[in-house]
């Protein structure tokens, strides 16, 4: 019969031969011969193949070094690298999370829009009228102004982005 | 360990027929193509036979065509040569070997068959 | 039929000296599918050499392969006592049948 010069899914050409791929978790040993199939291996502790390959050496899994900022937050398998993640108050540099850096926090003026996560940074919105901060915080939202009315109270001075509104009592009208 | 057991050889008549066996442990034997090497007395190796991991495929050296055959029972993890109408010329050593795309890397430690009269 | 010649038919050397043992194809032959044995008496051939020039496993780095296309070389950079021995070589690219060359005999002088 005619050589192939196309291989199905999971299979690789070589040397005019349909060769079956290693399963995911296994490394290719020996090439397949016309009389025996392809000699694979699982790859050891500490290594992985995520895909139906013909790779001869396993991938090392990841490291999540501690002195980096990082932990690992799933272990790998001999099919999944292991997945690193940031201590607390900290998050990966990259979508690679090979380093960590930590959380910045929002200035007074600014608040939380969404808080920090192993592998994202805070983002912080602009206090909008009406609303303030008055810390630097990696956790706090913009506060409401004070409501002088509902306190039976009138503002003696206006809020800012920064600053709350101060009240105080309301003048006395004299018959 | 990985291991290639031969047995079944022993003095025979000419014409008369003998079958050889290869036991193997170690290793998915249904895996693996056979072969089955042959050595005379102070000669040097010749190939004799092959059979594909599932048994479908097999060849043969033009010496032992039509007398030979080749035969495997991965359930019993064994390898046959069942040897016909034998020849003085057919005395060796015979080995069994697997197959690889490295070349034959495990040999069996042989039997002797001796063809005489 | 590819046809292997080896030479020399003998080889009379001294432990520590280096062997060259010369394999030449009939035909072109692929190699990634050349490979030298090696056979003591009353042994088994062994595996040492595969694809023309890949040590099989466990064998030293002494013993290494070279070549293509027709000519093919076994070297031994120096021999040990347990070297003393016969070496064939063998195509396993075009068959039937697999050939074997006729050995070369390493011997101690």
């Known amino acids: 019969p005619e050589p192939p010069t196309a291989c199905r899914e999971k299979q690789y050409l070589i040397n005019s031969q349909c060769c079956s791929l290693c399963q995911p978790g296994q490394k290719l040993v020996s090439d397949c011969t016309e009389f025996t199939e392809t000699e694979c291996l699982p790859c050891g502790e500490s290594e992985f193949l995520d895909t139906w390959n013909r790779e001869t050496h396993c991938h090392q899994h990841k490291y999540c070094d501690p002195n980096l900022g990082l932990r690992v937050q799933q272990k790998g398998t001999s099919e999944t690298d292991t997945i690193c993640t940031c201590e607390e108050g900290w998050h990966c540099t990259s979508e690679a999370c090979e380093s960590c850096v930590l959380h910045r926090s929002c200035s007074p003026g600014f608040g939380v829009k969404q808080i920090a996560t192993g592998v994202s940074d805070t983002i912080c919105e602009p206090c909008p009228v009406g609303f303030f901060s008055n810390v630097s915080s990696a956790f706090e939202k913009c506060h409401p102004w004070t409501s002088c009315e509902t306190k039976d109270l009138v503002v003696q001075q206006a809020g800012t982005n920064k600053t709350d509104v101060v009240c105080g009592p309301q003048d006395r009208l004299r018959a | 360990q990985v291991q290639l057991v031969e047995s079944g050889g022993g003095v025979v008549q000419p014409g008369r027929s003998l079958r050889l066996s290869c036991a193997a442990s170690g290793f998915t034997f249904s895996s693996y193509g056979m072969h089955w090497v042959r050595q005379a007395p102070g000669k040097g190796l010749e190939w004799v036979a092959v059979?594909?991991?599932?048994?479908?495929?097999?060849y043969y050296a033009d010496s032992v065509k039509g007398r030979f055959t080749i035969s495997r029972d991965n359930s019993k993890n064994t390898l046959y040569l069942q040897m016909n109408s034998l020849r003085a010329e057919d005395t060796a050593v015979y080995y069994c070997?697997?197959?690889?795309?490295?070349?034959?890397?495990?040999w069996g430690q042989g039997t002797m068959v001796t063809v005489s009269s | 039929e590819i046809v292997l010649t080896q030479s020399p038919g003998t080889l009379s050397l001294s432990p520590g000296e280096r062997a060259t043992l010369s394999c030449r194809a009939s035909?072109?032959?692929?190699?990634?599918?050349l490979a030298w044995y090696q056979q003591k008496p009353g042994q088994a051939p062994r595996l040492l050499i595969y694809g023309a020039s890949s040590r099989a496993t466990g064998i030293p780095d002494r013993f290494s392969g070279s070549g293509s296309g027709t000519d093919f070389t076994l070297t031994i950079s120096r021999l040990e006592p347990e070297d003393f021995a016969v070496y064939y070589c063998?195509?396993?690219?075009?068959?039937?049948?697999?050939?074997f060359g006729g050995g070369t005999k390493v011997e101690i002088k």
């Open positions: 070997a697997r197959d690889t795309s490295r070349g034959h890397d495990i």
């Open positions: 063998q195509q396993y690219a075009d068959y039937p049948p697999f050939t």
């Open positions: 035909q072109s032959v692929s190699s990634s599918y």
């Open positions: 059979i594909s991991y599932e048994g479908s495929n097999k």
